[in-house]
């Protein structure tokens, strides 16, 4: 899955002299970009990919550049004009944004500066300055005990969960020994109480993406369409879309004065938390959880529609829309059921029409097993 950058700083630099790029690893949690006539200097808390200093292209003029930090790829790099300079290939620490520091540096200002990041996805324009410094902190060691959850704490929890989903056999990686249902509940609870600015926030990890929307009072006026980004070419499911009918939001509207509700979309690229007795195979290991905060959504008059674009399947495989049912006693694993979901199949597209919200998937059933799924 191609991840967005965790941090992107873009600007324009007027190159009046022959000049260089300097990268300086710094021991504290800050990323800074400093401009002078002789050099553009980047400080960050990641080891350098040698060499630490390189010459910029010769022609003078206005250069557009962007500093990208992608934690999943472990890369910090600078695109200057058309040239790409790798600064660090060990930039995989999880950092939590604290604040942007006031710039006191003297020197030629950087122009048309903007910054975007996972903690503030909207593009923010910054006033011209010769230097910019962004302070970070480490994620908290222990979860906060107050009602709301810090974004970075949630990011760290998702990272741990993603590591477990990647290597489920390494039990030591499991975020907690709790059963899958409790882990899902805990995750939902954190997503519904995470503090964030704006109407929507997204968290991307290798095996789990989570998006949270704040449902506005006007949400019931129209259907909500959600489209995934295109997956890597080799994945079984190339992309998916979700259509949530407006009736869904009309029933979730809180009374005036009541706190707004949230809609969660949890996109798993692993079925490690969804293991049934039959070791059923889920298409592309894709499980989509759709949850409205503190609301059990069932018996919808208009269905939720999930559409999956996928690879062509072998003749003996039937694709079946299913949802996850926890064992109420938690004494045995849950199972997949198709009750309340209708499957519409095309060669490379499967649509699920379901009358409730939960964790959905497309099951790969060998043709003889199809009836067994219906029996649930």
């Amino acid at each position: 899955r191609g991840h967005r950058e965790d941090f992107r700083f873009c600007s324009q630099r007027n190159q009046t002299h022959r000049s260089s790029l300097h990268y300086k690893p710094t021991p504290d949690l800050r990323i800074s970009i400093e401009n002078s006539e002789e050099a553009l200097t980047v400080h960050a808390p990641f080891p350098a990919a040698h060499p630490a200093s390189r010459s910029f292209p010769d022609p003078r003029g206005l250069y557009h550049f962007c500093l990208y930090w992608n934690r999943h790829a472990g890369r910090l790099h600078l695109l200057y004009g058309k040239r790409d300079f790798l600064l660090s290939d060990k930039a995989s620490s999880l950092l939590c944004f604290q604040h942007q520091e006031e710039s006191l540096a003297q020197g030629p200002p950087l122009l048309a500066t903007s910054v975007t990041s996972w903690w503030s996805p909207q593009n923010i324009s910054l006033p011209s300055a010769a230097s910019f410094t962004f302070s970070f902190h480490s994620p908290p060691h222990t979860a906060a005990h107050n009602a709301s959850v810090d974004m970075c704490e949630l990011k760290r929890d998702l990272q741990l969960l993603s590591q477990f989903l990647k290597h489920p056999q390494k039990a030591s990686r499991r975020p907690s020994a709790a059963p899958a249902s409790q882990q899902l509940q805990s995750l939902e609870s954190k997503l519904t109480s995470v503090r964030f600015m704006g109407d929507m926030v997204s968290f991307e990890e290798d095996r789990i993406n989570a998006t949270v929307w704040k449902l506005q009072p006007t949400a019931g006026l129209q259907d909500l369409h959600i489209h995934s980004r295109q997956e890597e070419e080799q994945s079984e499911i190339m992309e998916y879309s979700v259509l949530l009918p407006r009736t869904l939001f009309q029933r979730t509207k809180g009374r005036s004065g009541e706190a707004e509700k949230r809609l969660l979309l949890v996109d798993f690229s692993s079925q490690a938390l969804f293991q049934d007795k039959n070791s059923s195979q889920v298409l592309g290991e894709k499980v989509l959880g759709i949850v409205v905060q503190n609301t059990k959504v069932a018996n919808l008059t208009e269905p939720v529609v999930l559409t999956f674009q996928h690879q062509l399947q072998p003749k003996n495989v039937t694709l079946q829309c299913v949802f996850w049912v926890e064992d109420p006693t938690l004494s045995s694993p849950g199972h997949w059921s198709s009750a309340g979901c209708e499957t519409v199949r095309r060669e490379t597209q499967t649509s699920c029409f379901c009358n409730h919200l939960t964790y959905f998937a497309v099951l790969m059933v060998s043709s003889v097993e199809v009836d067994a799924v219906h029996k649930h």
Partner: antibody, heavy 116, light 107 residues
């Protein structure tokens, strides 16, 4: 208030070992790089070692490389300097200092004397 | 490594006078230079960082200037408590290095 307190200094014979500690309070220790700096009696300041905020990266002065090890325990808000194969020229006051653009906070220092 | 040469080694002045301390680097260190004050039996105290930024709580009579290889610490009007040893330090390259110090003494 923001404070660094060193301990563990003393008199030690050449070739022996000593471990210095520096306990931090009043700030989020795990967010800062930390350094050890020393000062021989009547002499100037000499930088010894640095450790990244998370312990992932360390640098040493040539004079101590291979003999001294800097480490930290963020859960205890403590910085360490393990000094092995001590020499007479390691005699100095050892300071720990916090990294923020420069050394913005210093401890009061602990004296290490290497003598037979 | 970067060598920092401070001059003069000793500066004898009276309270109220202006003090100018110099620090020269063996190669360009941009603006990554700090100044510290140290009194006998005490730890150093940060005065100026990144060539010209005054550290928190440092009086306005202390100012820094310079970039590249030549830097200056100026004390506009000496107070009795300013008589001490002053060190410059660079953080542009590992290893971090200090100047040998300038002793500011009462004339």
């Amino acid at each position: 208030q923001v404070q660094l307190v060193e301990s563990g200094g003393g008199v030690v014979q050449p070739g022996r070992s000593l471990r210095l500690s520096c306990t931090a309070s009043g700030f989020t220790f795990s967010t800062y790089g930390m350094h050890w700096v020393r000062q021989a009696p009547g002499k100037g300041l000499e930088w010894v070692a640095v450790i990244w905020y998370d312990g992932s990266n360390k640098y040493y002065a040539d004079s101590v490389k291979g003999r001294f090890t800097i480490s930290r325990d963020n859960s205890k808000n403590t910085l360490y300097l393990q000094m092995n194969s001590l020499r007479a020229e390691d005699t100095a006051v050892y300071y720990c200092a916090r990294h923020l653009d420069s050394f913005d906070i210093w401890g009061q220092g602990t004296m290490v004397t290497v003598s037979s | 490594e970067i060598v920092l040469a401070q001059s003069p080694a000793t500066l004898s002045l009276s309270p109220g006078e202006r003090a100018t301390l110099s620090c020269r680097a063996s190669q360009s260190i941009s603006s990554y230079l700090a100044w510290y004050q140290q009194k006998p039996g005490q730890a150093p105290r940060l005065l100026i960082y990144d060539a010209f930024n005054r550290a928190t709580g440092i009086p306005a009579r202390f100012s820094g200037s310079g970039s590249g290889t030549a830097f200056t610490l100026t004390i506009s009007s000496l107070e009795p408590e300013d008589f001490a040893v002053y060190y410059c330090q660079q953080r542009d390259y590992w290893p971090i290095t200090f100047g040998q110090g300038t002793r500011l003494e009462i004339k």
